[in-house]
């Protein structure tokens, strides 16, 4: 179950010459309202056929009175979304009709009069849970701009709203074989409860043990494609394995329809119902147009109505491919510099920068030392996005504010005793050792192994290290 939502952005004259006259006048003020009708599949049904997926009516828009002599502007719109709830699975492909109605508010006897101002129709592909898809449709000289999306109602999730989510029983993870429900990461996908063998692509269930078929599929497990070829003819009953059983010869024998077209008998011959993107007597000609709704993920289709016309899909951020069918892993291009963390939010790319760096792509190296003073004569050293102080002798700590204890590291070797001094440290060496750090042993004959003691100092005297 879920809701199809339609947001009307504007309704007004389209581009080009021949702007339409305003539908309202000073004598006849009016207001607009909209009706949407949804049908599953890519059917080219008549506008009067039932809205099998549902329909909705908007509120009335503000009252509008034309300013004499002014061209028709975009007309004031009703507030809010049009919402069409659907009870079953979202079909993925659907047909829509959006009607713009005018309610005249003059002095009509019997109350306001309604008249249809414009009707647009189309066929689209749309996954539930995806972003808003934007569209522009023209009806005569009028142009309608709108956005739409399908969203699932909890506990349903997925592109068809057929997967169910339940709150986690354990706080840490989902049960065996069950995935977290994106985007509801604190919930888990409910175990499949459909009838065993029910087609995961063409069937769905709302109750345990059930197997209900999406449009175009039949059979107890929804594995049999519905065929229109002479199944209704009196010559043969329907079969669960083929969808059709035709004992006698007929114009549809051998299926003359190419490219997956389905054949149906007519009084004189046969007729091919062609799949999306094919046309011609036997579906032998390929030609996708915007009417076929070829653009995915909210892509905007540009192209003519003629089957020979090309089309292109103008893709929203985060999608690419000729039909906007591929999600771009924009982080794989490593756009964040200086070790920044890349986050693809779908509608935008964000970089979370390391300390000391800034900018949309972490490209700016902040001056780590700017405004950072090192005390007691220390000097600031930049690097790696963090500042560091190189401290003068006798001081330490992050900002050289701490008086260093030069003896803390026990610098005097061989048991020498350390004394702190204003300009450093002094080692008083144990008998038999000498040097600034008492690092040199004194030979028994009184000669030192390495350099001789400076004049005036006996081995064993304190050596001041400068």
């Amino acid at each position: 179950a879920g809701v199809f939502e339609l947001q009307i952005h504007s309704f007004g004259p389209g581009p080009g010459p021949g702007a339409p006259r305003s539908p309202c006048s000073a004598r006849l003020p009016c207001r607009l309202f909209f009706r949407v009708c949804l049908k599953p599949g890519l059917s080219e049904e008549a506008a009067e056929s039932p809205c099998a997926l549902g329909a909705a009516l908007s509120a009335r828009g503000p009252v509008y009175t034309e300013q004499p002599g002014a061209p028709a502007p975009d007309l004031p719109l009703p507030d809010g979304l049009l919402q069409v709830p659907f009870r079953d699975a979202w079909p993925g492909t659907f047909s829509f009709i959006i009607e713009t109605w005018r309610e005249e508010l003059g002095d009509q006897i019997g109350g306001p009069a309604w008249s249809l101002l414009a009707r647009v129709a189309g066929r689209r592909r749309l996954a539930a849970g995806g972003p808003w898809a934007r569209d522009i449709q023209r009806a005569g000289a009028w142009e309608l701009r709108f956005s739409y999306r399908a969203r699932c109602e909890p506990p349903a999730v997925g592109t068809a709203c057929t997967r169910l989510c339940r709150p986690r029983s354990a706080p840490s993870r989902c049960g065996p074989g069950l995935r977290p429900c994106a985007p509801l990461e604190d919930e888990c996908e409910a175990p499949l409860v459909c009838r065993a063998g029910c087609s995961p692509e063409h069937g769905f269930c709302e109750q345990p043990g059930e197997c209900r078929c999406l449009e175009g599929w039949t059979g107890p497990l929804c594995t049999v494609p519905v065929s229109t070829s002479s199944c209704l003819s009196p010559r043969g009953p329907s079969s669960a394995t083929t969808g059709c059983l035709v004992p006698g010869p007929g114009p549809c024998d051998g299926n003359p329809c190419a490219n997956g077209g389905s054949c149906s008998e007519t009084p004189r011959s046969f007729e091919c119902t062609c799949p999306r993107g094919f046309y011609g007597l036997r579906c032998e000609v390929s030609g996708v147009t915007c009417a076929d709704g070829p653009c995915f993920n909210g892509g905007l289709c540009v192209g003519g109505a003629d089957p020979d016309s090309a089309y292109i899909c103008h893709c929203p951020p985060g999608f690419q491919g000729s039909n906007c069918e591929k999600r771009v892993d924009r982080c794989s291009l490593q756009p964040c510099r200086n070790g920044g963390l890349c986050l693809d939010l779908g509608h935008a790319l964000r970089c979370r920068c390391r300390a000391g760096f800034a900018g949309p792509r972490c490209e700016h190296d902040l001056d780590d030392c700017a405004g950072r003073a090192c005390a007691n004569g220390g000097t600031c050293v930049e690097g790696g996005g963090a500042h560091r102080c190189s401290c003068a002798l006798g001081f330490g700590g992050r900002d050289c504010r701490e008086r260093a204890d030069p003896c803390a590291a026990r610098p005097c070797a061989h048991g020498g005793r350390c004394y702190a001094h204003f300009s450093g440290l002094v080692c008083a060496c144990a008998p038999g050792y000498m040097g600034a750090r008492c690092e040199f042993p004194v030979h028994p004959d009184g000669a030192s192994a390495l350099p001789a003691a400076p004049p005036g100092l006996r081995p064993g005297d304190p050596q001041r290290y400068l």
């Epitope: 103008h314 929203p316 491919g321 000729s322």
Partner: nanobody, 115 residues
């Protein structure tokens, strides 16, 4: 209002070639989808070739293998290279640009293919 300007149209014999240019224009940027449409007398306007904002190209069935669309984002220009031209390619050719909010049209350039 910024306009798209086409050039390169003219008269050519069947089998000949022409190269249409559109721009330079500040409208022609990499985030726009671009196209060349054509309209023959008494017929509706149709997209002959298009190049999307993500770089995908598509062509009308009748021109596949003969026409090539390309863009030069540095020069803010889009091109249509037409070869093996036929009489049925005679039409006014329009340059077109669009993003999600707006669409832009040129005034059109006439291409005539006759012996």
């Amino acid at each position: 209002e910024v306009q798209l300007v086409e050039s390169g149209g003219g008269e050519v014999q069947p089998g000949g070639s022409l190269r249409l240019s559109c721009g330079p224009s500040e409208i022609i940027t990499s985030d726009k989808s671009m196209g060349w449409w054509r309209q023959a007398p008494g017929k509706q306007r149709n997209l002959v070739a298009g190049i999307s904002n993500v770089g995908s190209t598509n062509y009308a069935q009748s021109v596949k293998g003969r026409f090539t669309i390309s863009r030069d984002n540095a020069k803010n220009t889009v091109y249509l290279q037409m070869s093996s031209l036929r009489a049925e390619d005679t039409a006014v050719y329009y340059c077109y640009a669009r993003d999600f909010e707006n669409e832009y049209w040129g005034q059109g350039t006439l291409v005539t293919v006759k012996p």
